[in-house]
């Protein structure tokens, strides 16, 4: 397969929908940034399709994406992060579709990690803590976090709490006694940078104590 498109192929290609979406991750690997793009139509034939970004780059005019199955990505330090870049889908030397995108508006933070829940017997509450790599970053430092929890038996009944810190207190009386809960957290840029929710952290599971009949309080586990 030569990678060249014959005229017929190009005519066919123009009938296809080459809509794509991208997200950036800043300082994802040391001072390296990443940009990931994918076609919105999972059935598009990507055999000879390549992505290229031009403009708003440091020292270079354009960069080519690498392809990993259906995903196209760049890992680089060369994003200027000022102004818009032109991201194009190409076949051979022909651009099929392009988008002008400011990479600071499509930021997807890294998922939070080290989520844990500690029961405080004296305070009758649960302290939820988690960590985020963004505390150490130069660019995307300020995030809004979405903590979601549910009783394990309630498959789609999630309760969401938005917060800007990495610590949350859940009052024991707001939770069912002697129940297993699942909790998880994700993040979104909240200052200057715009974009998308991160992936969810791995879930953490905890059990609420039984109710102590004499005092009406829950027993710690």
């Amino acid at each position: 397969e030569s990678g060249y498109a014959q005229n017929g192929d190009l005519e066919d290609a123009e009938l296809d929908d080459y809509s794509f979406s991208c997200y950036s991750q800043l300082e994802v690997n040391g001072s390296q940034h990443s940009l990931t793009c994918a076609f919105e139509d999972p059935d598009v034939n990507i055999t000879n399709l390549e992505f290229e970004i031009c403009g708003a780059l440091v020292e270079v005019k354009c960069l080519n994406f690498r392809k990993l199955q259906e995903i196209y990505f760049i890992e680089t330090k060369k994003f200027l992060l000022i102004g818009k870049s032109n991201i194009c889908v190409k076949v051979g030397e022909k651009s099929l579709t392009c988008k002008k995108i400011d990479l600071t508006t499509i930021v997807k933070p890294e998922a939070p990690f080290d989520l844990s829940v500690v029961y405080r017997e004296g305070a009758n509450d649960f302290v939820v803590t988690f960590n985020t790599s963004h505390l150490q970053k130069k660019y995307v430092k300020v995030l809004m976090h979405d903590v979601a929890y549910r009783q394990e038996k309630d498959e789609n009944k999630w309760t969401h709490v938005n917060l800007s810190s990495t610590k949350l207190t859940l009052l024991q009386r707001k939770l069912q006694p002697a129940a297993m809960y699942e909790i998880k957290v994700r993040s979104i840029p909240d200052h200057y940078f715009k974009g998308f929710w991160s992936e969810w952290s791995p879930s953490y599971y905890f059990r609420t104590p039984e109710i102590n009949n004499s005092s009406g309080e829950m027993d710690p586990i």
């Epitope: 397969e1 990678g3 040391g30 001072s31 390296q32 390549e50 290229e52 440091v58 020292e59 270079v60 354009c62 960069l63 080519n64 994406f65 690498r66 392809k67 760049i74 890992e75 680089t76 330090k77 060369k78 190409k90 030397e93």
Partner: antibody, heavy 119, light 107 residues
């Protein structure tokens, strides 16, 4: 203007270690890019040996991996090549060059230094 | 490893001729290809990167085309200073590999 300059002994004995240094001027090796070593045996084509990335990580060609070490001295803005257990097959012109990884080119090259492996 | 098959290995041409050199990758490499010119006793010089883009300071008689597996370097009108050896190189996957070279000689 970015400039690279190789230096090191021109003659190495078989089984010994070949050591070369590339001195970079006009650009810091810790700012960006991969910093590469490439070699060219007499009358033959080019072979990529490996690189040290601006972050300090290294990547080597599998055929030489067991014998190659690329390191750097950031205070001198230099990076170095060590190739152990050399044989006559390692006789070549050795070049250092900038590029690769996120860009698809080597844009700046040293002038090359000839290394002969002989007893 | 990705093999880069360059052809021809040598060619004779005259000043003013149009010269075409091809490079065939053993698997698809997108646009991750560069072309270099090397003169005897000198380091290679970058001519084309990203398969089709002309490097800074390189005369416009040099052009690159192709993507995927098949690539071409064209010199539209050969000049005396163009007699040299030309190499393609892929950066798509490790180890980065070069073609065997094409020596362009005076007819």
């Amino acid at each position: 203007q970015v400039q690279l300059q190789e230096s090191g002994p021109g003659l190495v004995k078989p089984s010994e270690t070949l050591s070369l240094t590339c001195t970079v001027s006009g650009y810091s090796v810790t700012t960006d890019y991969a910093w590469n070593w490439i070699r060219q045996p007499p009358g033959k084509g080019l072979e990529w040996i490996g690189y040290i990335f601006y972050s300090g990580s290294t990547t080597y060609t599998p055929s030489l991996k067991s014998r190659v070490t690329i390191s750097r001295d950031t205070s001198k803005n230099q990076f170095s090549l060590k190739l152990s257990s050399v044989t006559a097959a390692d006789t070549a012109v050795y070049y250092c060059a900038r590029g690769g990884y996120d860009v698809n080119y080597f844009d700046y090259w040293g002038q090359g230094t000839t290394v002969t492996v002989s007893s | 490893d990705i093999q880069m098959l360059q052809s021809p290995s040598s060619l004779s041409a005259s000043v003013g001729d149009r010269v075409t050199i091809t490079c065939l990758a053993s698997q698809t490499i997108g646009y991750w290809l560069a072309w270099y010119q090397q003169k005897p006793g000198k380091a290679p010089k970058l001519l084309i990167y990203a398969a089709t883009r002309l490097a800074d300071g390189v005369p416009s008689r040099f052009s690159g085309s192709g993507s995927g597996t098949m690539f071409t370097l064209t010199i539209s009108s050969l000049q005396p200073e163009d007699f040299a050896t030309y190499y393609c190189q892929q950066f798509f996957s490790y180890p980065w590999t070069f073609g065997g070279g094409t020596k362009v000689e005076i007819k």
